[in-house]
């Protein structure tokens, strides 16, 4: 299996944005790569977003996706937006080398993303 590395812990910003790098130990320069972000919480795994990209090109997620990303060599910089406290969980990076063959699959150990909902601003009198 292909080795995939990602940070153990990331804290989302007060605006509910979390970014992390997913790096894969490619055996060579794949021309087509698929990156999937999975969320594991309470022993359930759900797909957050996925993108297939050609090496040298930008990642393209679906228009309604909460993910954006850029690639550089064998690194993918992923950003997940719109996170709330209830979205806290383990976010796993899955990388597939789709072309040329043979197919390679790598799954990271996951990044624990902590999301803290911002405190509502108290009314202030001037």
């Amino acid at each position: 299996a292909m080795h995939v590395a990602q940070p153990a812990v990331v804290l989302a910003s007060s605006r509910g944005i979390a970014s992390f790098v997913c790096e894969y130990a490619s055996p060579g320069k794949a021309t087509e790569v698929r990156v999937t972000v999975l969320r594991q919480a309470d022993s359930q795994v759900t797909e957050v977003c996925a993108a297939t990209y050609m090496m040298g090109n930008e990642l393209t997620f679906l228009d309604d996706s909460i993910c954006t990303g850029t690639s550089s060599g064998n690194q993918v910089n992923l950003t997940i937006q719109g996170l709330r406290a209830m979205d806290t969980g383990l976010y796993i990076c899955k990388v597939e080398l789709m072309y040329p063959p043979p197919y390679y699959l790598g799954i990271g150990n996951g990044t624990q993303i902590y999301v803290i909902d911002p405190e509502p601003c108290p009314d202030s009198d001037f």
Partner: antibody
Framework: QVQLQESGPGLVKPSQTLSLTCAVS?????????WNWIRQPPGKGLEWIGY???????YYNPSLKSRVTMSVDTSKNQFSLKLSSVTAVDTAVYYC???????????WGQGTTVTVSS | EIVMTQSPATLSVSPGERATLSCKAS??????VAWYQQKPGQAPRPLIY???YRYSGIPARFSGSGSGTEFTLTISSLQSEDFAVYFC?????????FGQGTKLEIK
């Protein structure tokens, strides 16, 4: 696990064509990967000659391109190298090796020594 | 083509000591660098790929680092079986190229 084995004449006369074959076992050539030839002159470093792909595509080192031809025989699960108009500088150990496209070489043959001499 | 320059050409180290081998690329190759070990009469054996990842079965005393144009192979505590020739290899750009090798010998 994949194994590669080179074969061919150990002695070639100057101006003739060097012909080598690499037999692959434990993996079907047509399933993927790229199949390479690399050589090592006596006491020197490694020189990549080129590859032939699982799909028949190829790329040769520009320094040797005019003299190199590679082919693949999927029915015999082997690939071959032909190097024409050889001279003494082509004397080397010739290795066949496997890699992922533009990748490192994860499997090598044991190498076969070719001497160019009259 | 990309030229890979290894230094030193020969390195003399005592068993149990640390060995550091250098490889410089003539242009940026990202992290697409591998290292091989070759013993007399044998084919090269992959040690490290993608700059820092050990090939399967390679002991933890072998480690790789670097990016761009400068790369290092470190052997933390030399064993008798580690004395050999080491080659770096770039697979960022065709034609694929190798360094000229560093001979690691017993001091």
């Amino acid at each position: 696990q994949v194994q590669l084995q080179e074969s061919g004449p150990g002695l070639v006369k100057p101006s003739q064509t060097l012909s080598l074959t690499c037999a692959v076992s434990g993996y079907s050539i047509s399933s993927g990967y790229y199949w390479n030839w690399i050589r090592q002159p006596p006491g020197k470093g490694l020189e990549w000659i080129g590859y032939i792909g699982y799909d028949g595509s190829n790329y040769y080192n520009p320094s040797l391109k005019s003299r190199v031809t590679m082919s693949v025989d999927t029915s015999k699960n082997q690939f071959s190298l032909k190097l024409s108009s050889v001279t003494a500088v082509d004397t080397a150990v010739y290795y066949c090796a496997r890699n992922y496209y533009s990748g490192y070489f994860d499997s090598w043959g044991q190498g076969t020594t070719v001497t160019v001499s009259s | 083509e990309i030229v890979m320059t290894q230094s030193p050409a020969t390195l003399s180290v005592s068993p149990g000591e640390r060995a550091t081998l250098s490889c410089k690329a003539s242009q940026n190759v990202g992290t697409y660098v591998a290292w091989y070990q070759q013993k007399p009469g044998q084919a090269p054996r992959p040690l490290i790929y993608s700059t820092s990842y050990r090939y399967s079965g390679i002991p933890a005393r072998f480690s790789g680092s670097g990016s761009g144009t400068e790369f290092t192979l470190t052997i933390s505590s030399l064993q008798s079986e580690d004395f050999a020739v080491y080659f770096c290899h770039q697979y960022d750009t065709y034609p694929l190229t190798f360094g000229q090798g560093t001979k690691l010998e017993i001091k």
